[in-house]
C-alpha cells in the first residue's frame, strides 16, 4: 500500500488503490506497529550504546522471548499455514507482558509505546478471528506474567536498558516474520 501521511515508508508493499481486503488490513496494521517499534528503537539507541553491541554479545540473556523457528512453519521453506498461524498468535500473546514492561521505559516516546501495545492487542484479535477453528493456542498464565514483570522491573538500570533493546529487536524480528508469512495465507 502506498505510504499514507504520517506513516513511515519502511512499510512499502507496492502501490495500491482499491479498498483493502482483510489480509491487506492486517498487513497494514503490522506495518504500523513496526513503524512504532522503529521510533522506540531510535529513542533507545540515542539513550544507550546497546544498539552498537553485537547480536552475539546480547544473546547471553535469560529472557525467553518468542522467536520463529523452522518447525513453526512460517518460513518460505516448509511453510504451513495452520502451524504458523498458531505460532504467530501464541507468540504475540507471549510478547504482551514484555510490551507492558516497555510502558514505563520511554520519556519522549511514551505515547508511541502505548500505541504499540494497544495495536498489538488489536492485531491479536484480528488474528484470533482468522484462526477461529484452531484450538492449539495457549494463553500465558496471568500469575506467571505478573511475577516476570516484577523481576524485569527489579533489574538494575543497565540490565533494564538491555532488556528494552532486546524486547524491541526480538519483537521487530517476530513481526517481520509474521508479516511475510501472513501474506501467504
Amino acid at each position: 500500500a502506498p505510504v499514507l501521511p504520517g506513516e513511515d515508508s519502511k512499510d512499502v508493499a507496492a502501490p495500491h488503490s482499491q479498498p483493502l481486503t482483510s489480509s491487506e488490513r492486517i498487513d497494514k496494521h503490522i506495518r504500523y506497529i513496526l513503524d512504532g517499534i522503529s521510533a522506540l528503537r531510535k529513542e533507545t539507541c540515542n539513550r544507550s550504546n546497546m544498539c552498537e553491541s553485537s547480536k552475539e554479545a546480547l544473546a547471553e540473556n535469560n529472557l525467553n522471548l518468542p522467536k520463529m523457528a523452522e518447525k513453526d512453519g512460517c518460513f518460505q521453506s516448509g511453510f504451513n499455514e495452520d502451524t504458523c498461524l498458531v505460532k504467530i498468535i501464541t507468540g504475540l500473546l507471549e510478547f504482551e507482558v514484555y510490551l507492558e514492561y516497555l510502558q514505563n521505559r520511554f520519556e519522549s516516546s511514551e505515547e508511541q509505546a502505548r500505541a504499540v501495545q494497544m495495536s498489538t492487542k488489536v492485531l491479536i484479535q484480528f488474528l484470533q478471528k482468522k484462526a477461529k477453528n484452531l484450538d492449539a493456542i495457549t494463553t500465558p498464565e496471568p500469575t506467571t506474567n505478573a511475577s516476570l514483570l516484577t523481576k524485569l522491573q527489579a533489574q538494575n538500570q543497565w540490565l533494564q536498558d538491555m532488556t528494552t533493546h532486546l524486547i524491541l529487536r526480538s519483537f521487530k524480528e517476530f513481526l517481520q516474520s509474521s508479516l511475510r508469512a501472513l501474506r501467504q495465507m
Epitope: 505510504v3 519502511k10 512499510d11 512499502v12 507496492a14 502501490p15 518460505q76 511475510r180
Partner: antibody
Framework: EVQLVESGPGLVKPSQTLSLTCTVS??????????WSWIRQPPGKGLEWMGV???????YYSPSLKSRTSISRDTSKNQFSLQLSSVTPEDTAVYYC??????????????WGKGTLVTVSS | QAGLTQPSALSVTLGQTAKITCQGG??????AHWYQQKPGQAPVLVIY???SRPSGIPERFSGSSSGGRATLTISGAQAEDEGDYYC???????????FGGGTHLTVLG
Amino acid sequence: EVQLVESGPGLVKPSQTLSLTCTVSGGSITASFDAWSWIRQPPGKGLEWMGVIAYDGSTYYSPSLKSRTSISRDTSKNQFSLQLSSVTPEDTAVYYCARKSSWLIGYGMDYWGKGTLVTVSS
Amino acid sequence: QAGLTQPSALSVTLGQTAKITCQGGSLGSSYAHWYQQKPGQAPVLVIYDDDSRPSGIPERFSGSSSGGRATLTISGAQAEDEGDYYCQSADSSGNAAVFGGGTHLTVLG
C-alpha cells in the same frame, strides 16, 4: 521457480515508442503482495528503476520518466509490458523485468529476467 | 528523487572483510536491499529488508542498517565475489524504487 523473460525489438528509431513485454512463468502476476518492475541499465552505467505494476493492477513510475512511461498487463497471458515514448539514443540500455515478492517486506526484487538490449538509433 | 550514495570502487584482499556502505535520506525509513552483478549478467539479490539473506546466498554476506546508512559486509571475501554491488531502497513516498550508483568490488590476491 519463477522465471521472467523479456521480449521486444532490439532496435528502435529516435522519437518512436519502445515496447517490451515480460512473460512470467512459475508464478502469477496477480499473486497478493507481489509487484512487477522494469529496470534499465545503459551500457557501462548503473541500474535505473523505471516503474512498477502491483498485483492489483495499480502502477507507479519513476518521477524522472513518468511523462514517457506506461506499464500495463495481460493477466490471461501472465505478462506485463513497458512502453517508453519519444525515445532518444540516451534510452539505449539493457532492459530488465523483475519481481518484488510477498516474502520481502520492502521494495527489493528477488527474481530478474536475463535482460534485453535495446538500441535507439536511426 | 534523491538517490543513494555508494563508493564507486573498493578493493579487498582475499579472505579479508569488505564493507560497502550506502547513504541516503530515505534509508532512515525504508528497507535497504543489496544486489551483486557480474559482467553480462542480471543482478542477483544478496540481502533484502536490511539484514535478511535469500536462500542460496553464502553466509559470508550480511547486511545492517542504522539511521540513513546501510552496510553490506562480506566476511572472508572470495575471488568469485568480485563484481558490482548496488544498494536499493524506496524513495520517501514509498512507491518508487531507488538504486545507488554501484560499487565495483575487486578481490586482490
